[in-house]
Interface confidence: low
């Protein structure tokens, strides 16, 4: 048993048929002495009397906000979870397995830049009891400051007859030079607790592999004289670490017609224009990468050639 | 410590073609190692990162572009002196900083090319001959080191009587590669930042 | 859910061409991104093609460029993998793929959340 914060702790079970469960005694917070007694949940059952209760804790009817009394005084509360073990391996029932970029990924992070500021997201089928906290660091040993805030409910989407909930927090590198060569990944544990389930949910990086830049802005269309041609521009994303001439990025260009016929066309470029055969109906868009390290692509910017 | 915006004419930098060829090399080496040594932990999850220039050179305090020398948390305490002649730095304005910035490039290449040259005369002698380093990264690092022109001291080749650990020699290769990406990533950022100043 | 299956699939020769379909279940198939991957004895699965949902937007690997053609009828709940000039190095397991999430690269796995069981195409000479 271990405190995950004042009042709340955590039991640690190995689930199987049958387990023994884990001896717990609780303590009332209380300079009193006699007359006390306990009571689990709403149940005004007693459950035994004197400063301390010794219980057995075998599976969630256990579990529970235990209180002590005296005389119809509430004196204090000991919140018990659960944690199971099963097979040796800590259960991950609350959130969803996005399954990128490997099985068993449950938190998925991104940058947007590298100034140290970084996104995590997850995904759970539960709307309703459930509770997230997030810690970060740079490194697991002599850890170094990251603050994050706190989990938000991000987006909601129907899969087939089930709703699926997106959370996300925002953290960001108390101390980080954009320039920095990592050596120590981040460290980010997510604390997931649903009705009297408690599971945490780790994961380790480096802010150059999650790096995703803003799409490109001011992507705009200026026809060449004489020419069905335009001559299609675009900028670095306000988002995007400085000086650009550091921090460069690549582009895709892409060319997409209205007709099923036509064909896209698609060109890469470390330029901020380009040149574009603009068809009727057809729209161009821009994506970015960093230059010289391969992380993920940006969203499309597009504009129609209309 | 830090590269001032007064830095080579436009057209008057050589080095940039040349780190754009050594992080090329560097990555499809990278990936070469992380195919053939697939039974090997030899991904970024799975490897240590150490850096063999670390206390040694200063590369990225040394080489900070201007605009980050505001950002405290860039700013290293670490002195380290530099020789200061560089065929790279082919204008006048050129300042003390920028070459403290090349010549620390020049070090850094200098001791990745004795510590691979030492990894590959080892990897030579494995019987089962999986691995070798790429000519090619070798003959770049080569060429980015002559495009910098420092006069230094010629480090030896490590030279060890023990028979070689093929397995700790491979995880060793491992480790200096994807170290030697993250610098040559800095390496290709530094030098388009003076290409473009 | 989505269920996706796939046909066409068979042997032909060298140069020869192939029309494999792959018809998803469920009522918003146009809400999906579709592609065609593919898996050779004892390699990674690799990426064919990819369509967007209304069929505006498509991609290629390299080595299909011209040769294969990806197209969907949104109101048959099919898409199409044209194969023509087959090559020896064609031959794999092609499986269609279905992603609601469209922010993720569509050339690549993890955009897709529903997967068909495959379709055996070989090429002989």
């Known amino acids: 048993i271990w405190e995950l914060k004042k009042d709340v702790y955590v039991v640690e079970l190995d689930w199987y048929p049958d387990a023994p469960g884990e001896m717990v005694v609780l303590t009332c917070d209380t300079p009193e002495e006699d007359g006390i007694t306990w009571t689990l949940d709403q149940s005004s059952e007693v459950l035994g009397s004197g400063k301390t209760l010794t219980i057995q804790v075998k599976e969630f009817g256990d579990a529970g906000q235990y209180t002590c009394h005296k005389g119809g005084e509430v004196l204090s509360h000991s919140l018990l979870l659960l944690h199971k073990k099963e097979d040796g391996i800590w259960s991950t029932d609350i959130l969803k397995d996005q399954k990128e970029p490997k099985n068993k990924t449950f938190l998925r992070c991104e940058a947007k830049n590298y100034s140290g500021r970084f996104t995590c997201w997850w995904l759970t089928t539960i709307s309703t009891d459930l509770t997230f906290s997030v810690k970060s660091s740079r490194g697991s040993s002599d850890p170094q400051g990251v603050t994050c805030g706190a989990a938000t409910l991000s987006a909601e989407r129907v899969r087939g007859d089930n709703k699926e909930y997106e959370y996300s927090v925002e953290c960001q590198e108390d101390s980080a030079c954009p320039a920095a060569e990592e050596s120590l990944p981040i460290e980010v544990m997510v604390d997931a607790v649903h009705k009297l389930k408690y599971e945490n949910y780790t994961s380790s990086f480096f802010i150059r592999d999650i790096i995703k830049p803003d799409p490109p802005k001011n992507l705009q269309l200026k026809p060449l004289k004489n020419s069905r041609q335009v001559e299609v521009s675009w900028e670095y994303p306000d988002t995007w670490s400085t000086p650009h001439s550091y921090f460069s990025l690549t582009f895709c260009v892409q060319v997409q017609g209205k007709s099923k016929r036509e064909k896209k066309d698609r060109v890469f470029t470390d330029k901020t224009s380009a040149t574009v055969i603009c068809r009727k109906n057809a729209s161009i868009s821009v994506r970015a990468q960093d230059r010289y390290y391969s992380s993920s692509w940006s969203e499309w910017a597009s504009v129609p050639c209309s | 410590r830090n590269l001032p915006v007064a830095t080579p004419d436009p057209g008057m930098f050589p080095c940039l073609h040349h780190s754009q060829n050594l992080l090329r090399a560097v990555s499809n080496m990278l990936q070469k190692a992380r195919q053939t040594l697939e039974f090997y932990p030899c991904t970024s999850e799975e490897i240590d990162h150490e850096d063999i220039t670390k206390d040694k050179t200063s590369t990225v305090e040394a080489c900070l572009p201007l605009e980050l020398t505001k950002n405290e948390s860039c700013l290293n305490s670490r002195e380290t002196s530099f020789i200061t002649n560089g065929s790279c730095l082919a204008s006048r304005k050129t300042s003390f900083m920028m070459a403290l910035c090349l010549s620390s490039i020049y070090e850094d290449l200098k001791m990745y090319q004795v510590e691979f040259k030492t990894m590959n005369a080892k990897l030579l002698m494995d019987p089962k001959r999986q691995i070798f380093l790429d000519q090619n990264m070798l003959a770049v690092i080569d060429e980015l080191m002559q495009a910098l022109n420092f006069n230094s001291e010629t480090v030896p080749q490590k030279s060890s009587l023990e028979e070689p650990d093929f397995y700790k020699t491979k995880i060793k290769l491992c480790i200096l590669l994807h170290a030697f990406r993250i610098r040559a990533v800095t390496i290709d950022r530094v030098m388009s930042y003076l290409n473009a100043s | 859910e989505v269920q996706l299956v796939e046909s066409g699939g068979g042997s032909v020769q060298v140069g020869g061409s192939l029309r494999l379909s792959c018809v998803a279940s469920?009522?918003?198939?146009?809400?999906?991104?579709m592609g065609w991957f593919r898996q050779a004895p004892g390699k990674e699965r690799e990426f064919v093609a990819a369509i967007s949902g209304e069929g505006l937007i498509s991609d290629y690997r390299d080595s299909v460029k011209g040769r294969f053609t990806i197209s969907r009828d949104n109101a048959k709940n099919t898409m199409y993998l044209q194969m023509n000039s087959l090559k020896p190095e064609d031959t794999a397991v092609y499986h269609c793929?279905?992603?609601?999430?469209?922010?993720?690269?569509?050339?690549?796995?993890?955009?897709?959340?529903?997967w068909g069981q495959g379709t055996q195409v070989t090429v002989s000479s």
């Open positions: 793929a279905a992603g609601q999430w469209t922010n993720g690269p569509f050339t690549r796995e993890r955009t897709y959340e529903y």
């Open positions: 469920g009522r918003t198939f146009n809400m999906y991104v």
